[in-house]
C-alpha cells in the first residue's frame, strides 16, 4: 500500500509589521498588525 | 532622494552611553521618517527604533526600549539615537534610514535610503 503524507513544501511565516497613524492622518500612536504569509491579517 | 551621513559611533565600556546622529541633505527631510537599524557581524541587519516625520511618534525594538531614545530636529535636517545603558550585545554598524509615508516602520524593505553606517562597539 502506498503511503502519502500532506505537506506543503514551505513554511508560512508570520512578522509584526508597526505604522504610524501619523503618517496617514493627524492622529498620533502606533498600529500593529500582522503579516502571515505575505498577507497582512491584524 | 536624500543622502544620510551618520556619526557618532565608537567604542565604550558596558554601562556607558553614545549618541549617534544622522545629518540628511537633498530632499525635504520633514517629508520622511526615519529609522535606526543595526547590524552585527554574521546576523542581519535588525530594527532598532522609527520615528515619525514630525517626531511625534516613535517606536522602539523591544531589547533597546528603556535604553535608547530616537528624536529628530527638522531645523537641522538631522535625527538622533540616544543610547544608554549599553550591552556588549549591542555591539553593531548602526545606520540611519529615510522611509516615505505609508509604510511599515519596523522593517527595512520600507526604507529606500540608507547612510553608510557608523560602527558601536561595545566592550565588557
Known amino acids: 500500500d502506498a503511503e502519502f503524507r500532506h505537506d506543503s513544501g514551505y513554511e508560512v511565516h508570520h512578522q509584526k509589521l508597526v505604522f504610524f497613524a501619523e503618517d496617514v492622518g493627524s492622529n498620533k500612536g502606533a498600529i500593529i498588525g500582522l503579516m502571515v504569509g505575505g498577507v497582512v491579517i491584524a | 532622494e536624500v543622502q544620510l551621513v551618520e556619526s557618532g559611533g565608537g567604542l565604550v565600556q558596558a554601562g556607558g552611553s553614545l549618541r549617534l546622529s544622522c545629518v540628511a541633505s537633498?530632499?525635504?527631510?520633514?517629508?520622511?521618517?526615519m529609522g535606526w537599524f543595526r547590524q552585527a557581524p554574521g546576523k542581519d541587519r535588525e530594527f532598532v527604533a522609527a520615528?515619525?516625520?514630525?517626531?511625534?511618534?516613535?517606536y522602539y525594538e523591544d531589547d533597546v526600549k528603556g535604553r535608547f531614545t530616537i528624536s529628530r530636529d527638522n531645523a537641522k535636517n538631522s535625527v538622533y539615537l540616544q543610547m544608554n545603558s549599553l550591552k556588549p550585545e549591542d555591539t553593531a554598524v548602526y545606520y540611519c534610514?529615510?522611509?516615505?509615508?505609508?509604510?511599515?516602520?519596523?522593517?527595512?524593505?520600507?526604507?529606500?535610503?540608507w547612510g553608510q553606517g557608523t560602527q558601536v562597539t561595545v566592550s565588557s
Open positions: 534610514a529615510a522611509r516615505p509615508s505609508y509604510v511599515a516602520v519596523n522593517i527595512a524593505a520600507s526604507y529606500n535610503n
Open positions: 520615528i515619525s516625520r514630525s517626531g511625534g511618534t516613535t
Open positions: 537633498g530632499r525635504t527631510f520633514s517629508n520622511y521618517g
